[in-house]
Every structure is written in C-alpha cells, then in structure tokens.
Interface confidence: medium
C-alpha cells in the first residue's frame, strides 16, 4: 500500500484547515492507528492527535477542542483530520505516520501553510500646494503573511516607492506616492491597490487628492468704456479667480472709500445709478489659507452731455 | 513481559474524589496507548479514558470535565484522577496497555492489570 496526502496545505488565518492522510492499500488490510505529529525542523516531534481503531480519537492537551476527525461518513482507511480555526503558530511541517495489518508503518509529511490577509491603512502626507516640488501625495500600509503588494490606481501622474519590513510570522509593505502638486489634481482620486493570496478580491482604499492654489485675479465688467455713463443702472464688477480652498473677496477704492450707495456681494460689487463721484481705482483682493492674488482697474464714469458738446465744438470746428 | 498492577481504588461519598494508579513491572515508553476499563457488576466492560504517548487523551463521555488521565513514562505509571464520583461510577477499574507490533504492524499485543475496587456510596 501507500500514503496519499498533499505537499502543502493552505488556508487562511481562522479557517479550519484540513490534514489528508489516506492509506491506499491492497485487499485484506486494515489501518489500526494514525498518529498526526508537528515535526518542525529543529525541534522534537509534538503529537497532535491519534486516531486508534479501538479507541478512538486522541488529542494532545495544546491542541484540545481544534483537532477533529472529518464528519461521517469515514473510510476506516482515511486518517485524515482537521485543525479548527488556524492560526499563524499553526504554520509548519506536520507528519502522519500510520500503522497497518499486515503490512507495518507508513509516513508522509506535509507543510501547513497559513494566509494572514492584510488589513491595509492609508496615510496621506502633508497638505498638497501648488508649486511645491515633488512631493508625497500618500503611503499604504499593509502587513501580512506572505508579503502583500501594494500598488496604486490613479490617473495622476507620479513616482511610487516601496520598502518591506519582515517580522517573525509575516512581512509588512509600504509604498509611497509622490508627486508634483499642481491645480489640475484636484478632486482626483488616488487609489491604494492590496493584493493577497489570502484575499478573494484586490482591497482598495481611496484617497482623493486636494492641492492648494489660488489662481490670478481679473475684473470683468469693464469690456465696454462706454456702458459706465452716469445715470446707468445695474453696472457692476465681478472678481474672477479660483482656488482651493474656495477663496473670500474683498473690495477696496485706492484713492478712497467706497462711495455710498456702493453693495459688496462676495466676487461681485454692485453700483447704484452712475455718478461721476463712481470713477475712481478699485481694488479686489482675492485670498485664501493659501496664497492672496490684487486685481485693480479704473473706473472713469462718462458725461454723455460733455461727450455731446466736445462733438458739437468739433462739428463747428470742421 | 510488562505486568501492570493498580492501586487507590476504595469507598467513597458520592461528590468525592479518588486517584488511581497503575504501575508497570517494565518500561511503559513503548506503549503505545495505555488507558482505564471499568466493569459494573452484571455489565459489559466499558472504555473509561485512554492516553497515548504523546500525552493525547480521548475519555467516555460519562466521565468528560470529572476525570483526568494521565501518565509519567520516567515512572512507569498511569494515573487517573476521579472528582465528583457517583454511585454510577462503581465498579472494577484495569488498567491496560498496548504495544505495535515489529516495524510499527498494528497487532497490537495487549496487556492487562488485575483491577481495583471503586464503591461510590454514602
């Protein structure tokens, strides 16, 4: 007759792990005992448990209430058992040695080998700010058994390094994104990508990337000279900028206050009827926590009734 | 030959406690699984707990959380720690032993102790 059994077992951490041992044997013989030992390089034999055709099912006291024998229906020729809830100690060589009429004693061996699936961290680095270098975005954590990898998913574009650390029972792997902040990565997703042998699908944390700036100010509202006449109504100017975070604005006159009647909302200032006490230098000041950009520009109100006598003077003139 | 000759057994009050020896005449190391039968008056012998020598115990569900067996090959001694005795449990307790056969056969050659006396009564 022969053994039959695995080379390596595999199982993930907390499951229950299955030792075959099946004795093929020729017609007539019959197994009287299996006995299960841990046999780890450099250290004696450790009984795990033996299964006795008289007896019964022995366990040793260090595995009592893991060790069992495969629900019914059983081979007499089947010395498999199982090892509940596996844990990373667990991780080793193992033997099964079976005694048979008439043919004697028969071993194999077998290498228990138990996943320790990651749970992975990410850590994003310091705040993101435009015209900073090359700078790290985020780091992914994650620790296992075997070593896990650790990539990244993203359309952004940046340089990624790794390192392992290795512990007594498994590996933990650190990989770092960097990348050149600029104003365009913002509300871009980066994705941290943990790969296991222990794990039914890839694990993905995602971090979603904000990169401080404050983009230049302009006015608008000034593209025609000719609208800003007195008596006109509705004239306003609108503060355009962007940035992260959305900035405040605030609006000043160079050569004074602003004059009465004058309303302030936000990016936007808003004048009552046109008079000549309107012209004047106008600032708008655009700030965040990062930066702070100025954008002025004059105001000259128009007489339309100084406009009309300078053409009459002219007509006559010609 | 190995003899096995068993000690401590007696009369006890149910809730009680007793520990059974059994001593080999030879080395008990190459025993393969040595253990605990008892037989009440008028009944079959039944299996009480039984040790391999790897220390591993297997034990009759009667007796599961109230006795512990155990051996001390240096010794040449199986023991069996009895707690919270009941009248049930009354009977001859032998000791036995079992060796494979050459080159580990399973012809197991089977030895047997003469029994001890335990009376769980108040």
């Known amino acids: 007759g022969e053994l039959e059994t695995s080379d390596v077992v595999t199982v993930v951490l907390g499951q229950d792990a299955k030792l075959p041992c099946f004795y093929r044997g020729d017609s007539g013989e019959q197994v009287g005992q299996v006995a299960w030992a841990r046999v780890d390089a450099g250290e004696g034999a450790q009984e795990l448990a033996l299964l006795h055709s008289k007896y019964g099912l022995h366990v040793s006291p260090a595995y009592e209430g893991r060790v069992e024998q495969p629900p019914p229906p059983r081979n007499p020729l089947d010395g498999s058992v199982l090892l509940r809830n596996a844990v990373q100690a667990d991780e080793g060589e193992y033997e099964c040695r079976v005694s048979t009429f008439p043919a004697g004693s028969f071993q194999a061996r077998l290498r228990l080998r138990v996943l320790v699936p990651p749970l992975p961290s990410l850590n994003p680095g310091p705040a993101l700010e435009e015209g900073q270098g090359l700078t790290l975005a985020a780091s992914c954590t994650a620790e296992g058994s075997p070593a896990p990898s650790v990539t990244w998913d993203t359309e952004v574009k940046g340089t990624t390094s790794s390192r392992s650390f290795k512990h007594s029972r498994s590996a933990a792997v650190t990989s770092e994104f960097h990348l050149v902040p600029s104003r365009s990565m913002n509300g871009q997703p980066l994705t941290c990508v943990v790969s296991h042998p222990g794990l039914l699908q890839d694990q993905r944390i995602t971090h979603i990337l904000h990169v401080s700036f404050l983009a230049e100010a302009s006015v608008r509202g000034l593209e025609d000279q000719n609208l800003w006449h007195i008596g006109r109504e509705g004239a306003m100017l609108k503060c355009l900028s962007e940035g992260q975070p959305p900035p405040s604005y605030n609006w000043t006159r160079l050569d004074g206050p602003l004059p009465s009647g004058v309303r302030v909302d936000g990016d936007t200032l808003g004048f009552p009827p046109l008079t000549t006490e309107h012209s004047g230098i106008y600032v708008c000041h655009v700030s965040n926590e990062f930066s702070s950009r100025d954008s002025q520009v004059t105001v000259d109100v128009l007489d339309p009734q100084e406009d009309s006598g300078k053409q009459v003077d002219l007509v006559s003139a010609s | 030959q190995v003899q096995l000759v068993e000690s401590g057994g007696g009369l006890v009050q149910p809730g009680g406690s007793l520990r059974l020896s059994c001593a080999a005449s030879?080395?008990?190391?190459?025993?393969?699984?040595m253990g605990w039968y008892r037989q009440a008056p008028g009944k079959q012998r039944e299996l009480v707990a039984t040790i391999t020598s790897g220390g591993s115990t297997n034990y009759a569900d009667s007796v599961k959380g109230r006795f512990t067996i155990s051996r001390d090959n240096a010794n040449n001694t199986v023991y069996l720690q009895m707690n919270s005795l009941k009248p049930e449990d009354t009977a001859v307790y032998y000791c036995?032993?079992?060796?494979?056969?050459?080159?580990?056969?399973?012809?197991?050659?089977?030895?047997w102790g003469q029994g001890t006396q335990v009376t769980v009564s108040s």
């Open positions: 030879g080395s008990i190391f190459s025993m393969n699984v």
């Open positions: 036995t032993g079992d060796q494979l056969g050459p080159l580990g056969t399973f012809s197991p050659i089977v030895y």
